[in-house]
């Protein structure tokens, strides 16, 4: 039961952050204008991957697409490769979990593919989450970086004889979203991993199999076969024969040709 | 077409309140803000504030912060100022105004302060 | 506060002419957002609400006739009508709308000769 729990809860948490991350992609508030030196301003400027915005006195609001590729920034092209690539493995994991999940039973998926389709997502959520705390914190970086350096020439004047103040932008509502979305997406991804564990077979115990060789009726009942990891043992040529009545969680042997859902 | 419609004049004694009002049409009335401006012979144009219907936020000039409130209705798309402990010197001309660069004004309300 | 000075205070033309007319800000209203200067201007007949004609220092407004040219930045701002026309004949404003409070000009009269 708690390994379907933690299989559930991982998927869930996963998905939330997954569906985070995609907002935080789309969001246009990934950088701010700081107000700190004009708080009084009608124009209020913030930007996304994607686009930059301007809400003006009227309330309006006026949005412009980067519409190059070459003329931006490396490091934003850099952030939006990993938030693409973060949703990207996340939504392949999402898919992959779907089948994976213990309280689905699709055809006769034996329980170390489940396992193998566990720890598959898992991984991937957990790679999907590093990639958005990543971009987020490259994004962070740079803003942090200009910040000073904006700030270090913060006026730039006509013969210092007007006064204008240089935009500086500061974090915007995008980044804690990210920041958020990405750390439940690995959390998501760890507890698929916790739960892909007590989905392995850890143990197949062998019921008693004669093997009759010519000549000698000898009777070979072996001892409790440790599989190394449960997924990826080499399960050719082994003869395995289900026991009687289990439990959900427990460890399930291959179902037989005549088991079916 | 977007249209503001203003309430008609008032003649009000010193020291009491007015509440004119600006009934909106034409556009979707919380997705800009309201502003109003007095208008007087001697002091030309005052921005005085805006309301902002969609989230019910305000801003005033601090020339106006203790002498004007300023309201919405978005149920009747209406925005509302009132004016309190009225001088001489608040009998002016007043505008609401909306849309990109004030695109959209009212005919104005003209309020006369009596003794 | 930004300080919106406006010269001259009065322009006395013949219609037909070309008619220029300035206005200074005490403080930048250059958004360096979207490279837009944020500068308004009006035309106000008397008994009339003012009447937008120019916003973000130089875009027309819609139905406003192209003799009407806003040009400048940073500080100086420019309102020029080409071929003065006797329905031109009003007070001209400008305005901030860069900075809060927004502030207006004093205004510039064009009167007929």
């Known amino acids: 039961m708690a390994v379907t729990a933690c299989q559930g809860l991982g998927f869930v948490v996963s998905l939330i952050g997954i569906a985070g991350i995609i907002a935080a992609t789309c969001m246009d508030q990934w950088s701010t204008q700081d107000l700190y030196n004009n708080p009084v301003t009608a124009v209020f400027n913030y930007q996304g991957l994607w686009r930059s915005c301007v809400r003006e006195s009227s309330g309006f609001t006026e949005c412009r697409g980067y519409f190059t590729l070459l003329g931006l920034p490396a490091m934003l092209q850099a952030v939006r490769a990993l938030m693409i690539v973060g949703i990207v493995l996340g939504a392949i994991g999402l898919l992959v979990s779907i089948f994976a999940l213990k309280c689905i039973r699709i055809g006769s998926m034996e329980d170390s593919a489940k396992a193998n389709m566990t720890l598959t997502s898992g991984i991937m959520f957990i790679v999907s989450g590093l990639c958005a705390i990543a971009g987020v914190s490259v994004f962070a970086n740079m803003l942090v970086t200009n910040f000073w350096m904006s700030t270090a020439n913060m006026y730039t004047g006509m013969g210092g004889m007007v006064q204008t103040v240089q935009t500086r932008y500061t974090f915007g509502a995008a980044l804690f979203v990210g920041w958020v979305a990405g750390g439940l997406t690995l959390i998501g991804g760890v507890m698929m991993c916790i739960a892909c564990r007590g989905l392995a077979p850890e143990e197949t115990n062998y019921k008693a199999v004669s093997y009759h060789a010519s000549g000698h009726s000898v009777a070979y009942k072996p001892g409790g076969f440790k599989a190394s990891t449960g997924f990826g043992s080499n399960t050719k040529n082994k003869k395995i024969y289900d026991g009687g009545a289990r439990t959900e969680d427990e460890v399930q042997s291959y179902p037989s040709k005549h088991d079916y859902v | 077409q977007a249209y503001l419609q203003q309430s008609g004049a008032e003649l009000v004694r010193s020291g009491a309140s007015v509440k004119m009002s600006c009934k909106a049409s034409g556009f979707t009335f919380t997705s800009y803000n309201i502003h109003w401006v007095k208008q007087t012979p001697g002091q030309g144009l005052e921005w005085i504030g805006y309301i902002s219907p969609g989230n019910g936020g305000s801003n005033y000039n601090l020339n106006f912060k203790d002498k004007a409130t300023l309201t919405a209705a978005t149920s009747s798309t209406t925005a509302y100022m009132q004016i309190s402990s009225l001088t001489s010197e608040d009998s002016a001309v007043y505008f609401c105004a909306t849309g990109r660069g004030f695109a959209y004004w009212g005919q104005g309300t003209l309020v006369t302060v009596s003794a | 506060d930004i300080v919106m000075t406006q010269s001259p205070s009065s322009l006395t033309v013949t219609p037909g002419e070309k008619v220029t007319m300035s206005c200074r800000s005490s403080?930048?209203?250059?958004?360096?957002?979207?490279?837009?200067?944020?500068l308004i201007w009006y035309q106000q007949k008397p008994g009339q609400p003012p009447k937008l004609l120019i916003y973000?220092?130089?875009t027309r407004d819609s139905g406003v006739p192209d003799r009407f040219t806003g040009s400048g930045s940073g500080t100086d701002f420019t309102l020029t009508i080409s071929n003065v026309q006797a329905e031109d004949l009003a007070v001209y404003y400008c305005?901030?709308?860069?900075?809060?409070?927004?502030?207006f000009g004093a205004g510039t009269k064009l009167e007929l000769k």
């Open positions: 973000r220092a130089s």
């Open positions: 403080q930048s209203l250059f958004n360096s957002g979207n490279q837009k200067n944020y």
């Open positions: 305005q901030n709308d860069y900075s809060y409070p927004l502030t």
